[in-house]
């Protein structure tokens, strides 16, 4: 019973985690304009893995896709790859784990097969979670580096009379979604691996057979042996539009210039 619960919970946690990884990958708010200690601009910039957006105070939001592959920073490409690998592995892991669930009967599938599938999906979830965490962390590190570089520029590049509004970027919501989702997928994977141990059938316990030979009594007990580990990989991509930030009502994205009533 505890095994079934652990497996079921591991599956649900991983499912939520992978949904979160997909959401994070698609979100536009990986980096958002830093508003602290900055002049209050009437324009708010934010960027995702696939496009960058500008939201005006007026409510008008404009997003532009990154329509180049070669022109993008290698780090951004690496983050995209990690997130996609994470989603692909997670999706495969989910597929495998559905068939591995103890509560689902598929023909005459043996418990040992279910145990192997549970372990496989668990490992896939772990790797998927690690990929997401790595991707988000690489992006966060990139942001921190750029933030301090642009901060240095703000204070050294003020020689002229004309000032520029330096747009610095800080952590966006997608990073936190990604970290939490990656963590959940990782936890779900660990739970699946734990469940696998309980699912694996104990080897047949033959009764001990005593052989009497020349005064010695030796008892042979065939023992069971378990093992297995492995590693996998990750993702899939889909685009959603996340209009948001600040208060919902003042952040409306409208495509046309006028509103006809």
């Amino acid at each position: 019973m505890a095994v079934t619960a652990c497996q079921g919970l591991g599956f649900v946690v991983s499912l939520i985690g992978i949904a979160g990884i997909i959401a994070a990958t698609c979100m536009d708010q990986w980096s958002t304009q830093d508003l602290y200690n900055n002049p209050v601009t009437a324009v708010f910039n934010y960027q995702g893995l696939w496009r960058s957006c500008v939201r005006e105070s007026s409510g008008f939001t404009e997003c532009r896709g990154y329509f180049t592959l070669l022109g993008l920073p290698a780090m951004l490409q690496a983050v995209r790859a990690l997130m996609i690998v994470g989603i692909v592995l997670g999706a495969i892991g989910l597929l495998v784990s559905i068939f591995a669930l103890k509560c689902i009967r598929i023909g005459s599938m043996e418990d040992s097969a279910k145990a192997n599938m549970t372990l496989t999906s668990g490992i896939m979830f772990i790797v998927s979670g690690l990929c997401a965490i790595a991707g988000v962390s690489v992006f966060a590190n990139m942001l921190v580096t750029n933030f301090w570089m642009s901060t240095a520029n703000m204070y050294t590049g003020m020689g002229g009379m004309v000032q520029t509004v330096q747009t610095r970027y800080t952590f966006g919501a997608a990073l936190f979604v990604g970290w939490v989702a990656g963590g959940l997928t990782l936890i779900g994977g660990v739970m699946m691996c734990i469940a696998c141990r309980g699912l694996a059938p104990e080897e047949t316990n033959y009764k001990a057979v005593s052989y009497h030979a020349s005064g010695h009594s030796v008892a042979y007990k065939p023992g069971g042996f378990k093992a297995s580990t492995g590693f996998g990989s990750n993702t899939k991509n889909k685009k959603i539009y996340d209009g948001g930030a600040r208060t919902e009502d003042e952040v409306q994205s409208y495509p046309s210039k006028h509103d006809y009533v």
Partner: antibody, heavy 118, light 113 residues
Framework: QVQLQQPGAELVKPGASVKLSCKAS????????IQWVKQRPGQGLEWIGM????????NYNEKFKKKAALTLDKSSSTAYMQLSSPTSEDSAVYYC???????????WGQGTSVTVSS | DIVMTQSPSSLTVTAGEKVTMSCKSS????????????LTWYQQKPGQPPKLLIY???TRESGVPDRFTGSGSGTDFTLTISSVQAEDLAVYYC?????????FGAGTKLELR
């Protein structure tokens, strides 16, 4: 069509606060910020602040924070600006304006001429 | 606050003439996110509220005659009227729409010779 209706004139005694109104119609009022602009006779334009009809969020020019208070009545789609302790310096035309694309002021009311005189 | 400096303060022209007026801001109005300049031009005729002419420094508002052209980027902007008509006589204001508080230039008055 988009309309921002303002009363033509207000005569105020020094020190007695005045509340100016601006009734918006002809568009989805809750989607656009309403701004207030001051213009003294023969002078330029000054941005006072703005209010969002949906959330009631406000953003003021620091210079007018103590002088002007922006409010609104959602049910009648009317924005208000209360001027506290008016002096002769506050005698001006006050416009209410809609904020449109590019954060530009795309539609203007006819303006309310405020005269502070005893 | 961003200071908007308009020049000249007044211009005397004859009908049909090409007119250019300048607006300079103390800070760049160019937003790196969309490469748009948040500068707006307005026209105000006597006894009327201002009227929007151009936003994003160069985008003409619908209904504005194409003799009005906005140009420039960063801190230096220009409004050009290719062939001045009698109805164009007014005060022209530029405005910073990028950083709060939103600020206006002192205006350029266009007069007929």
């Amino acid at each position: 069509q988009v309309q921002l209706q303002q009363p033509g004139a207000e005569l105020v005694k020094p020190g007695a606060s005045v509340k100016l109104s601006c009734k918006a119609s002809g568009y989805t009022v809750t989607r656009y910020w309403i701004q207030w602009v001051k213009q003294r006779p023969g002078q330029g334009l000054e941005w006072i602040g703005m209010i969002h009809p949906n959330s009631g969020s406000t953003n003021y020019n620091e210079k007018f924070k103590k002088k002007a208070a922006l409010t609104l009545d959602k049910s009648s789609s009317t924005a208000y600006m209360q001027l506290s302790s008016p002096t002769s310096e506050d005698s001006a035309v006050y416009y209410c304006v809609r904020m449109g694309l590019g954060n530009a002021m795309d539609f203007w009311g006819q303006g309310t001429s405020v005269t502070v005189s005893s | 606050d961003i200071v908007m400096t308009q020049s000249p303060s007044s211009l005397t022209v004859t009908a049909g003439e090409k007119v250019t007026m300048s607006c300079k801001s103390s800070q760049s109005l160019l937003n790196s996110g969309n490469q748009k300049n948040y500068l707006t031009w307005y026209q105000q005729k006597p006894g009327q509220p201002p009227k929007l002419l151009i936003y994003w420094a160069s985008t003409r508002e619908s209904g504005v005659p194409d003799r009005f052209t906005g140009s420039g980027s960063g801190t230096d902007f220009t409004l050009t009227i290719s062939s001045v008509q009698a109805e164009d006589l007014a005060v022209y204001y530029c405005q910073n729409n990028y950083v709060y508080p939103l600020t206006f230039g002192a205006g350029t008055k266009l007069e007929l010779r």
